[in-house]
């Protein structure tokens, strides 16, 4: 069926924010605050870092992460990958949706220089009911969390 | 009442563009062109740099600023902060909504090197009627304005 | 007439993805995948790199390009320009809509250093039926394509 937006329905939307618990160090996706502060869920649900779709359709999904550091940690890859990925029951592996690669450490010309950088992703994807979207950052050691305004994750139906 | 988008109503949207008058140097927010060229207001109003909400709801708000310079001005903080902030009568201090920090000067390895960088922010926030959203950049001396396409500010209800 | 979104109509939207054929080297706009993988067209059409509007209205248009290289190619301008441009039958030249300038090569402190950067643009513009939007990157030699997730172009009516 062609997706329509009916006038009596609430349009699904969500905005999730970063918190100290976002970075697990476990190799899993980032986790998010879903209720307090700027965070909300409307017509979408949340599970273990994932926005879970309850109504099939086309969604504009987005994420921003704040990166920062002092010089470059030893052993840190020169590339940071920030991506939005889809989990679907039909496939065992996550599917890449929107991805960025950046080399922010290269900005610091000395090993003691503080640097900041930001990565923003946004785009329209089709999602079925029950499918999930997560955010991953590799290497997450460079993600800087503060007050939920600098790193976040959201979506709305278009 | 649950917010709905009724089919007979126009969906609020706006896109404001940078102009020579955007940078005041007064410590206030950036000012914007609201009518000429690509700029428009539809179901939102404008006051002293702020997009003013006339209809409560969830809005995707966004801003991009073009940064640039030659080397790094003496005394310039190594961090540029670009943010979207909310003003509401009950809370006299602006509330952070979406914020990015960048260190673009660090890209220039010599003091005479020209550099350019761009910062984009976008996300969904809830706004009540009468609330205002503004854009701030610290240090605004590095914002480069030209013809309204490189620095801008907008919103639409989702 | 004021643009309205009627409940029986499908909302125009599209997401086009980068492919090996995107970079033509001809000085024209980037070309895009429109059907395979994550790419789709709904209520918009495509022609030679351009999203073509079939229904007049306000659209949020966006593009991301993945940039990367090893050092800086000789003769490469220190500035990369990534922009969204409008083609309209009324004017012979493309009109700038949203543009970013970046100096990503400056991040690499040695000529053999691999670097990555990403440029994101998004904003609301008014488009008439028949008007077209294209993406241009100058210098496109630094655009890095891979599997349609890193460089893309899309729009939806707001």
């Amino acid at each position: 069926l062609i997706q329509e937006r009916r006038s009596h329905e609430v349009n699904p939307a969500a905005h999730l924010t970063g918190a100290n618990s976002s970075l697990t160090g476990s190799g899993g996706p980032l986790l998010w605050e879903t209720q307090l502060g700027l965070a909300f869920l409307r017509g979408l649900s949340y599970h273990d870092g994932a926005l879970v779709v309850t109504k099939a359709g086309y969604y504009y999904i987005y994420s921003k992460v704040q990166l920062g550091g002092v010089g470059c940690p030893l052993g840190l890859a020169s590339t940071i990958t920030h991506g939005l990925y889809k989990r679907t029951p039909r496939y065992p592996e996550e599917l890449e949706l929107l991805v960025s690669q950046q080399s922010p450490c290269g900005r610091a010309t000395s090993s003691s220089r503080v640097w900041w950088d930001s990565s923003f992703l946004g785009g329209v994807v089709h999602l079925e009911a029950g499918e999930e979207v997560v955010v991953r950052v590799l290497d997450e050691r460079l993600v800087r969390l503060r007050d939920g305004t600098r790193s976040y994750f959201g979506a709305f139906m278009v | 009442l649950i917010q709905e988008r009724r089919s007979h109503e126009v969906n609020p949207a706006a896109h404001l563009t940078g102009a020579n008058s955007s940078l005041t140097g007064s410590g206030g927010p950036l000012l914007w062109e609201t009518q000429l060229g690509l700029a428009f207001l539809r179901g939102l109003s404008y006051h002293d740099g702020a997009l003013v909400v006339t209809k409560a709801g969830y809005y995707y708000i966004y801003s991009k600023v073009q940064l640039g310079g030659v080397g790094c001005p003496l005394g310039l903080a190594s961090t540029i902060t670009h943010g979207l902030y909310k003003r509401t009568p009950r809370y006299p201090e602006e509330l952070e909504l979406l914020v990015s920090q960048q260190s673009p000067c660090g890209r220039a390895t010599s003091s005479s090197r020209v550099w350019w960088d761009s910062s984009f922010l976008g996300g969904v926030v809830h706004l009540e009627a009468g609330e205002e959203v503004v854009v701030r950049v610290l240090d605004e001396r590095l914002v480069r304005l030209r013809d309204g396409t490189r620095s801008y500010f907008g919103a639409f209800m989702v | 007439l004021i643009q309205e979104r009627r409940s029986h109509e499908v909302n125009p939207a599209a997401h086009l993805t980068g492919a090996n054929s995107s970079l033509t080297g001809s000085g024209g706009p980037l070309l895009w995948e429109t059907q395979l993988g994550l790419a789709f067209l709904r209520g918009l059409s495509y022609h030679d790199g351009a999203l073509v509007v079939t229904k007049a209205g306000y659209y949020y248009i966006y593009s991301k390009v993945q940039l990367g290289g090893v050092g800086c190619p000789l003769g490469l301008a220190s500035t990369i320009t990534h922009g969204l441009y409008k083609r309209t039958p009324r004017y012979p030249e493309e009109l700038e809509l949203l543009v970013s300038q970046q100096s990503p090569c400056g991040r690499a402190t040695s000529s053999s250093r691999v670097w990555w950067d990403s440029s994101f643009l998004g904003g609301v513009v008014h488009l008439e039926a028949g008007e077209e939007v294209v993406v241009r990157v100058l210098d496109e030699r630094l655009v890095r394509l891979r599997d349609g997730t890193r460089s893309y172009f899309g729009a939806f009516m707001v």
Epitope: Q35, L36, G37, L41, R42 | I2, Q3, A56, G57, H126 | -
Partner: antibody, heavy 117, light 110 residues
Amino acid sequence: QVQLVQSGAEVKKPGASVKVSCRASGYTFTSYLMHWVRQAPGQRLEWMGWINVGNGNTKYSQKFQGRVTITRDTSASTAYMELSGLRSEDTAVYYCARNYYNWFDPWGQGTLVTVSS
Amino acid sequence: QSALTQPASVSGSPGQSITISCTGTSSDVGGYNYVSWYQQHPGKAPKLMIYDVSKRPSGVSNRFSGSKSGNTASLTISGLQAEDEADYYCFSYAGSSTVVFGGGTKLTVL
């Protein structure tokens, strides 16, 4: 202006339940969480739980888990807190408070619940 | 979630300044700039005095100020007045959609 108005005082027997209401006005009711906080005579404020008025999600303090139920009626812009299995130590003033970003503002005027045999 | 630690009581004379501390952990007070303070007069509902560590809502006197260092937040009242006598509570976001109150401090104006 933004306002929360609570229902009147209640006297209940041990083992009974009480349901306190909180009517909101002056803002978009469905776009904010509503918290419930209680204060026994001479004691500190004690957070009980919240409801996401938009989607009905709830979170309760472990202390009250299983005994408290927070609900809402969006058409009436009203939130409710029901506490069951009342005991004498539940005698307290019960407050509703709107969650605005990361603080509580405004608060309801409070509802005194007295549990007495 | 354990309550944040506040002194049970503080006192001061009119015109003096007093400070009330609120100690938590790196998971609440120390982890976020989301500390707020509430004033409660006997028989009245609490009233917001400070939010986001140091910001004042409109209508609150500038004699009230907030700050934070590490895991401890502080409320300072300068130029103490008789009407400041009340109970004061700190409150913090604690991550994962949880919140925590302080134990409360009784301010006596001598």
